[in-house]
Amino acid sequence: TALSPTPTTMTFTPAPLEETTTRPEFCKWPCECPQSPPRCPLGVSLITDGCECCKICAQQLGDNCTEAAICDPHRGLYCDYSGDRPRYAIGVCAQVVGVGCVLDGVRYTNGESFQPNCRYNCTCIDGTVGCTPLCLSPRPPRLWCRQPRHVRVPGQCCEQWVCDDDARRPRQTALLDTRAFAASGAVEQRYENCIAYTSPWSPCSTTCGLGISTRISNVNARCWPEQESRLCNLRPCDVDIQLHIKAGKKCLAVYQPEEATNFTLAGCVSTRTYRPKYCGVCTDNRCCIPYKSKTISVDFQCPEGPGFSRQVLWINACFCNLSCRNPNDIFADLESYPDFEEIAN
């Protein structure tokens, strides 16, 4: 189904727990690695093992893990050994929740608010720092001002607007509409001493199957930066999309199954059917990523207990003009993305 978790890739069966503290050795030195690295399923990161020896397919959520077979760091997973007391040898990959942040070498705890300087108030939310400006420039440059400048005023924290062509000022001056002025920023608008800010959605945490995407927004009653999340499924893991590429074409940017299906999540089923579009694949060195998309709310009904709703990425179109070297490392190409904004809301 459209939102089913990716299948686990490699599992370890823990030895029976004994009343002993002897731990098995998972690392061997010198390193013994296969001649060629493994081929990981689409969406699973190829990483160096915990022994710092060999390339392995990262363990996924719910998989067993050891000091050698480590959990996928790109998905915010860690190895939870709490079920293997007292040996702490074999754990289960779990999601990191409420991680702290590091900014300019200073560590902040999850939920902590701080002022890195006099101009911003920031909050650490699950590893991401969201900030709101404290300098709300009350008087934007006037319409007649062709070259406005923000200048530092001695003894004051916030910069002030100055206009170099004051001498040519017309008799009647008009203030810029503060909304129009603020809207010139990407996603900022001014309301009641709060500059609303919403970051772009992060890339989906998986290249196939169910993943998560996050963003920081302070568009709320308290003007407080909060992390928002949505489910995402760029493409199904169990469909070979290459088979659907038309003759003479190098890409199938969008794959859309014939049948409408229900989304499923943790045993709960969406209250209506959907026929989503997924990003496709190319036969050359290009990757397809969402280009035109939106966020929809999906209602789920559970067999026992109350239902719930989740925000879900809804893909309308995908862009396939980005080179991608390693499809298994979902962050391998972030630095090479061109200035290409995803059209999304």
Epitope: G248, K250, A253, Q256, K292, S293, A317, N321
Partner: antibody, heavy 121, light 113 residues
Framework: EVQLVQSGAEVKRSGASVKVSCKLS????????IHWVRQAPGKGLEWMGG????????VYGDKFKGRVTVTEDPSTDTAYMDLKRLTFEDTAIYYC??????????????WGQGTLVTVSS | QSVVTQPPSVSGAPGQRVTISCTGS?????????VHWYQQLPGTAPKLLIY???NRPSGVPDRFSGSKSGTSASLAITGLQAEDEADYYC?????????????FGGGTKLTVL
């Protein structure tokens, strides 16, 4: 009802560039793409370029490659067509037209009113 | 010249039936891509008349019909009326090694006698 409103007529010198805008209402650029088609005086329709939903990239007609740039601004639901190094042969009416982002949907549902671009010496 | 070919002109008396042909190749119409038809009245922008070979958008009279076979297609207009006098263009999609292109026929001028 989907409507496309284009910018006004332009007179340009040979060798200059022109940028024509196309404002969409009644739908959003999240759900469709805008293509550009031109028509020289007394001649037929000539497709210039637009986003190819199935190829996942902006594609251009062979005749215009390297000279035309098509862009979309989703925040204002406006599309732009930028044509460089104008010659007298570029004197034409330039139309924007919509294509729904649906597999296999290769036709133009709605058209703008057209923008006349005249290239003079 | 156009990748897709149309006759430059056709004519007919009011009430008559006329057809306009549209001939392509194996990289467009013959490759299975649909044919669409547009009507352009004098001094106005083109308007979608037939999509997907034979489908009419709402508001288009059933006097207009389209069909496709192999590498060609045709538009038929029955019960010809004076207001049908216009230019008619067929359009398809062309996928070749040089890339993807939307292709128009050269246009056919319909004169109502």
């Amino acid at each position: 009802e989907v409507q496309l409103v284009q910018s006004g007529a332009e007179v340009k010198r040979s060798g200059a560039s022109v940028k024509v805008s196309c404002k969409l209402s009644g739908d959003t650029l999240t759900d469709l793409s805008i293509h550009w088609v031109r028509q020289a005086p007394g001649k037929g329709l000539e497709w210039m370029g637009g986003f190819d939903f199935e190829d996942g990239e902006i594609v251009y007609g062979d005749k215009f490659k390297g000279r035309v740039t098509v862009t979309e601004d989703p925040s204002t639901d406006t599309a732009y067509m930028d044509l460089k190094r104008l010659t007298f042969e570029d004197t034409a009416i330039y139309y924007c037209a919509t294509i729904k982002d649906i597999p296999g949907r290769y036709y133009f549902d709605f058209w703008g009113q057209g923008t006349l671009v005249t290239v003079s010496s | 010249q156009s990748v897709v070919t149309q006759p430059p002109s056709v004519s007919g008396a009011p009430g008559q039936r006329v057809t306009i042909s549209c001939t392509g190749s194996s990289s467009n119409i013959g490759a299975g891509y649909d044919v669409h038809w547009y009507q352009q009245l004098p001094g106005t922008a083109p308007k979608l008349l037939i999509y997907g070979n034979s489908n009419r958008p709402s508001g288009v009279p059933d006097r207009f019909s389209g069909s496709k076979s192999g590498t060609s297609a045709s538009l038929a207009i029955t019960g010809l009326q004076a207001e049908d006098e216009a230019d008619y263009y067929c359009q398809s999609y062309d996928s070749s090694l040089s890339g993807s292109n939307w292709v128009f026929g050269g246009g056919t001028k319909l004169t109502v006698l």
